[in-house]
């Protein structure tokens, strides 16, 4: 039988009446155009909705936008367009919402052609009031908040000026001209690239990387011959043009650009690219594009300094610069990532790693599924997940994979079961153990979302026809109930729930179409009465993450430790609640060779845990450039994996000697770097 239709499914009692009492409709007094929705703050219930309607006239486009505010998670909305003087808001800038619970909002207005600068509307009180501010420049990008101080904003102008505000957009100062890219770092530091000659495009590869730590009072040039730069975790990366040719290499700094080391990664040519797939304070996943228009490259994982890299995955699908990759961090379980590879026959297959890129495998075939037409052997195949690439190819995939840190172990994704991704209509699959095992959850494509930290999963069928039914599950997708939320079906456009998956409210967005007009409509459903009581201790059960063999002493050990979690029992219908905190108990493991990556000059042969010396370096002294000094490495080939917490057990020896010689790694050495003040 189809998922959720077998006789052991326990029904949630009287749910229709409970949900009907908690379903709130709001019809927006708008012609249908575009709609964007933003949550303001965490657990505040405040939502801002911006509707925009364009009327193309003969000479120009006439635009109208409206702003609505809810403070009860979308149950009721109030038109607050008058707070922004009925101004047309530029949707391409979106709504710039401040970090954390600052309650700050910046809206960028459309202004007439001849004006001196742009216009913004600012709120510091969760959009209860707005202040209009005329800008001394025309913004090119959305206002960017400093992660440390929401009063500090930066923006680039259409004339490539870097503008900074220290009082939440009230007053602006141009701190630098000829800026291509600017980013906030830690401690209110700003990194940016500048061009000297023509333009950002013309000077690509000849840009300078600058830093200011005092919002533009003083500057330091921290790099030259820059192609681009990026920040990931505690690492600052720059791709730098080589002296002799058109290739470029990645350099990395962990001290905000004061000193640099060349990353032990392949150089790339003009048509290739580097991409930081994921980064944290321990390490980075880096994609290096293959030469030629192959659509794939190689994933490398770094050591704790971002310098020594291990090859993690070959033939990694990544179409072009800024193109599509399926690389997904499974946030519901430590160490888990999913991505796609392009196999020799050009089919696309899904791979998963449970140990932060150490080893990749295919996804286990769901027990309740048959292998499809792509499978050579009908009894042996894998699950293949649809992600960004499938969506970009306009396959019938409405959503990318979903996981939430506070819904431990749960991963939901569209997929097909075979030897490769299929172009046939996908089904929805769920894993409750972070990707080790999978079950078909829903037949056909659906939109889905997680509520109450996993206590409820909500889904809506993806259909071209109007819909009026929502499905929900209180047992991690095993059994489903359907609820008709309106008599009059709507053309569905999206599901919206508060980020963080702690809410019990879901908003269904769509539009109604009649003979003469169409209007935006939202239905917000509160599931609080379905989960009638608060969860108690007895509702939680113990689960060991990454467990594959209970008999094994090292069972569950990943990156040197294992973690037991308290997880909601599937049979418990209760509220985790907004204040729910994931309960976990870590336990340190003994070290084995699996806890070490191969050091500089060493590699791991396939299916072997031992690191062996690279043949071309045998018998040579291992000397390399680090932080602008030449280092001599004494090693037996191992370096602890970043973030690995193992203790005892295997303990390979490693020693680095400073040779007290200077070297520059094709880059600025610290004493050549210059500073200047305004």
């Amino acid at each position: 039988s189809a998922p959720g239709e077998d006789e052991e499914c326990g029904r949630v009692r009287d749910f229709v009446a409970k949900l009907a009492n908690n379903t709130h409709q709001h019809v927006f007094d708008d012609l249908r155009g575009s709609v964007s929705l933003s949550w303001v703050g965490d657990s505040t219930g405040v939502i801002l909705v911006l509707t925009t309607f364009h009327v193309p006239l003969v000479i120009m486009t006439f635009g109208q936008s409206k702003l609505y505010r809810s403070e009860d998670y979308g149950k009721n909305f109030k038109d607050i367009t008058d707070l922004i003087n009925n101004t047309f808001i530029r949707t391409e800038f979106g709504m710039a919402i401040g970090p954390e619970n600052s309650g700050k909002v910046v809206l960028t207005a459309e202004v007439s052609g001849g004006s001196r600068g742009g216009r913004i509307f600012r709120s510091s009180d969760f959009a209860k009031n707005f202040v209009q501010t005329d800008l001394p420049f025309h913004p090119l990008t959305q206002m960017m908040y400093s992660p440390q101080n929401s009063d500090y904003l930066l923006a680039l102008s259409t004339e490539n000026g870097l503008w900074v505000s220290k009082n939440f957009g009230g007053k602006w100062e141009e701190i630098h001209k000829a800026v291509c890219l600017a980013k906030w770092g830690s401690d209110n530091t700003i990194f940016f690239t500048t061009y000297a000659n023509g333009s950002c495009k013309a000077d690509l590869g000849a840009l300078e990387l600058w830093r200011t730590s005092d919002l533009g009072k003083s500057f330091k040039t921290i790099g030259v011959k820059i192609y681009s730069f990026g920040l990931g975790g505690r690492f600052l990366f720059a791709s730098v043009m080589a002296d002799k040719d058109t290739t470029r290499r990645i350099h990395v700094s962990t001290d905000q650009g004061d000193t640099w080391s060349m990353a032990q990664l392949p150089s790339v040519g003009q048509e290739q690219f580097y991409s930081i797939l994921a980064a944290n304070d321990d390490m980075v996943f880096m994609h290096v594009d293959e030469p030629g228009d192959t659509g794939f490259g190689t994933i490398f994982t770094s050591d704790d300094r971002g310098i020594v890299y291990s090859k993690s995955l070959d033939r990694h699908l990544y179409t072009t610069t800024g193109g599509e990759t399926d690389f997904t961090n499974v946030t519901s379980l430590r160490g888990v990532y999913i991505t796609s590879v392009l196999s020799e026959d050009n089919s696309i297959q899904t791979m998963i790693t449970f140990d932060q890129g150490g080893r990749w495998t295919h996804l286990r075939k769901p027990e309740n599924s048959e292998c499809d037409a792509t499978a050579k052997n009908k009894n042996e195949c894998s699950l293949h997940i649809h992600a960004s690439y499938s969506i970009s190819q306009k396959l019938n995939v409405p959503m990318a994979p979903l996981s939430e840190p506070n819904a431990v172990g749960i991963v939901i994704a569209h997929g097909s079961v075979g030897d490769a991704i299929s172009v046939m209509v996908p089904d929805v699959y769920i894993s409750d153990d972070g990707g080790y095992s999978w079950t078909k959850m829903l037949e056909g494509p659906h939109y889905y979302t997680i509520l109450d930290s996993g206590g409820i999963i909500v889904a809506i069928e993806h259909s071209s026809r109007p819909i009026n039914v929502i499905k929900f599950s209180t047992d991690e997708g095993q059994c489903w109930q359907t609820y008709t939320f309106t008599r009059d079906p709507i053309y569905f456009t999206g599901l919206a729930s508060e980020p963080g998956a702690r809410s019990m409210n879901i908003s269904i967005w769509g539009f109604t179409e009649s003979f003469l007009t169409s209007q935006w409509v939202s239905y917000t459903i509160d599931f609080k009465d379905i989960l009638e009581r608060n969860c108690e201790e007895k509702d939680y059960t113990i689960w060991l993450a990454h467990s594959t063999d209970p008999e094994d002493y090292e069972d569950g050990c990943i990156l040197g430790y294992k973690e037991q979690f308290l997880r909601l029992r599937k049979s418990s219908v209760c509220q985790n609640g907004r204040d729910y905190v994931v309960t976990k108990q870590p336990s340190i493991c003994l070290c084995s060779l699996e806890d070490f990556l191969c050091d500089f000059g060493y590699y791991r042969p396939e299916n072997d845990s031992k690191c062996v010396e690279q043949p071309e370096l045998k018998g040579h002294d291992l000397e390399f450039c680090l932080y602008g000094r030449e280092e001599h490495l004494t090693t037996n080939g191992y370096r602890k994996i970043p973030g690995d917490k193992c203790q005892g057990g295997v303990n390979p020896v490693r020693e680095v000697k400073d040779l007290k010689k200077k070297c520059t790694s094709n880059f600025l050495s610290p004493e050549k770097q210059n500073s200047k003040s305004n």
Epitope: T541, W543, A545, P550, D552, Q564, R569, S571
Partner: antibody
Framework: QVQLVQSGAEVKKPGASVKVSCKAS????????MHWVRQAPGQGLEWMGW????????RYAQKFQGRVTMTRDTSISTAYMELSRLRSDDTAVYYC?????????????????WGQGTTVTVSS | DIQMTQSPSSLSASVGDRVTITCRAS??????LNWYQQKPGKAPKLLIY???SLQSGVPSRFSGSGSGTDFTLTISSLQPEDFATYYC?????????FGGGTKVEIK
């Protein structure tokens, strides 16, 4: 092989306490829950609670809350169950039993290894 | 607490007979139902877990079925060593509860 060896029989007076030990061998002690179940003479089985040896966390049946304490010493792979304020109706055979696991899940799959039982007699 | 009701409380059967014992839960427990065999003076022994999975080392003449509230333990051909007391136990909701037991005696 996997086994649980319990301490010997005890005779206690009403109001006293008893502490029963259960030594595990042949498996990873921290990897499984340890349950305690008792059986009064001629009666059925009654679950008292469990201890999670990895974390030291416990869960007790409401009936025994406040009277039972479950502890463990991971260095010697031993679990303990102490019952205080003994009454004559606490006379029973007390068993420790390992919780069967299914992959990462610790509960729901029964108790697959049992100790030989410890007879506790409460009599004035 | 979930009540587990076993029936019959005792039964007499001969070697080779097919024996069925039922267990009913006071509310749905999905498939979290286990069966034990206990002989006098001995500790219980796990026979079936998760309603229908046979514990390793247990003869295949023992089988379990059911889900939700109604469960069955079947001994397809009773052997002399099978005369004992059988208990069902739910492990879906804390506290864990056992059925009252079914004593299988020689006819």
């Amino acid at each position: 092989q996997v086994q649980l060896v319990q301490s010997g029989a005890e005779v206690k007076k009403p109001g006293a306490s008893v502490k029963v030990s259960c030594k595990a061998s042949g498996y990873t002690f921290g990897g499984y829950l340890m349950h305690w179940v008792r059986q009064a003479p001629g009666q059925g089985l009654e679950w008292m609670g469990w201890i999670n040896p990895m974390s030291g966390g416990t869960r007790y049946a409401q009936k025994f809350q406040g009277r039972v304490t479950m502890t463990r010493d991971t260095s010697i792979s031993t679990a303990y169950m102490e019952l205080s304020r003994l009454r004559s109706d606490d006379t029973a055979v007390y068993y420790c039993a390992r919780g069967k696991r299914s992959s990462g899940w610790y509960e729901g799959y029964g108790m697959d290894v049992w100790g030989q039982g410890t007879t506790v007699t409460v009599s004035s | 607490d979930i009540q587990m009701t076993q029936s019959p409380s005792s039964l007499s059967a001969s070697v080779g007979d097919r024996v069925t014992i039922t267990c009913r839960a006071s509310q749905s427990i999905s498939s979290y139902l286990n069966w034990y065999q206990q002989k006098p003076g001995k500790a219980p022994k796990l026979l079936i877990y998760a309603a229908s999975s046979l514990q390793s080392g247990v003869p295949s003449r023992f089988s379990g079925s059911g889900s939700g509230t109604d469960f069955t333990l079947t001994i397809s051909s009773l052997q002399p060593e099978d005369f004992a007391t059988y208990y069902c136990q739910q492990s879906d909701v804390s506290p864990i509860t056992f059925g009252g037991g079914t004593k299988v005696e020689i006819k």
